[in-house]
């Protein structure tokens, strides 16, 4: 999950494998101030998971979340 410094969440590692799409309710991008660009997926249990925005499954999930 993202590490929060001065209320700016940043990610230092990415989950590599896909999360179940049905478990994800929303997402957000971390700040440009963070050293690693990241997408944070928020699960239905309100857990936050860092993901690599360049991964295919991450892009696919973002697209489907935008459309829903």
């Amino acid at each position: 999950s993202p590490y929060s410094s001065d209320t700016t969440p940043c990610c230092f590692a990415y989950i590599a494998r896909p999360l179940p799409r049905a478990h994800i309710k929303e997402y957000f991008y971390t700040s440009g101030k963070c050293s690693n660009p990241a997408v944070v997926f928020v699960t239905r249990k309100n857990r936050q998971v860092c993901a690599n925005p360049e991964k295919k499954w991450v892009r696919e999930y973002i697209n489907s979340l935008e459309m829903s």
Epitope: A16, K45, Y61
Partner: antibody, heavy 119, light 108 residues
């Protein structure tokens, strides 16, 4: 180095249940998502389901929904797969396989447990 | 649910190149993993995320993914490469891992 050691072969009668165990050594079970895959004699690999640690939930393949239960005992670093209402078509080698959180793909597999269903 | 199609068998002479295909609708939009399974043994991951190799896997194993076909290529084939090979993808519509039917590689 992580290793998965599974329980021994089982012979069951139709209608019975079987519970296969998979012990993790070298790491703690918390470090992994554990999946279960089976292979019938002379057939291909079939994914049965797996644990999603980020959500504390288990996902099951539709085919096995209601008949399979996957559990984990973190105190002993052991995962379990129980399949009920066994039929002859369930005769297969059952594998546990790890899906490490920050590495794609099923990197480490157990040695397999042969389950034979026969009357 | 998502279907992956592999040829049942591929034959190749030692030293030559084996290409194993894995077909699926718009498979290029998915990350493909490949496993090698020798008789009586558990599968081994040889390529992940289309073209990356786990440590310990020879450079002779490579992968690609375009259009409706992903391909595992084994260069300079050796007798020890004789095995069954399976492709695998994540199907986000069903939240299931899906395996191809497997391809038996025979070294002549």
């Amino acid at each position: 180095q992580v290793q998965l050691v599974q329980s021994g072969a089982e012979v069951k009668k139709p209608g019975a249940s079987v519970k296969v165990s998979c012990k993790v050594s070298g790491y703690t079970l918390n470090d992994f998502a554990m999946h279960w895959v089976r292979q019938a004699p002379g057939k291909g690999l079939e994914w049965m389901g797996g644990y999603v640690p980020e959500d504390g939930d288990t996902i099951y393949a539709q085919k096995f929904q209601g008949r399979v239960t996957m559990t984990e005992d973190t105190s002993t670093d052991t995962a379990y797969m129980e399949l009920s209402s066994l039929r002859s078509e369930d005769t297969a080698v059952y594998y546990c396989a790890t899906d490490p959180l920050y590495t794609p793909g099923l990197y480490v597999w157990g040695q397999g447990t042969t389950v034979t269903v026969s009357s | 649910s998502y279907v992956l199609t592999q040829p049942p068998s591929v034959s190749v002479a030692p030293g030559q190149t084996a290409r194993i295909t894995c077909g699926g609708n718009n498979i290029e939009s998915k990350s493909v993993h490949w496993y090698q399974q020798k008789p009586g043994q558990a599968p081994v991951l040889v390529v992940y995320d289309d073209s990356d190799r786990p440590s310990g896997i020879p450079e002779r194993f490579s992968g690609s993914n375009s259009g409706n076909t992903a391909t595992l290529t084994i260069s300079r084939v050796e007798a020890g490469d004789e095995a069954d090979y399976y492709c695998q993808v994540w199907d986000s519509n069903t939240d299931h891992w899906v395996f191809g039917g497997g391809t038996k590689v025979t070294v002549l």
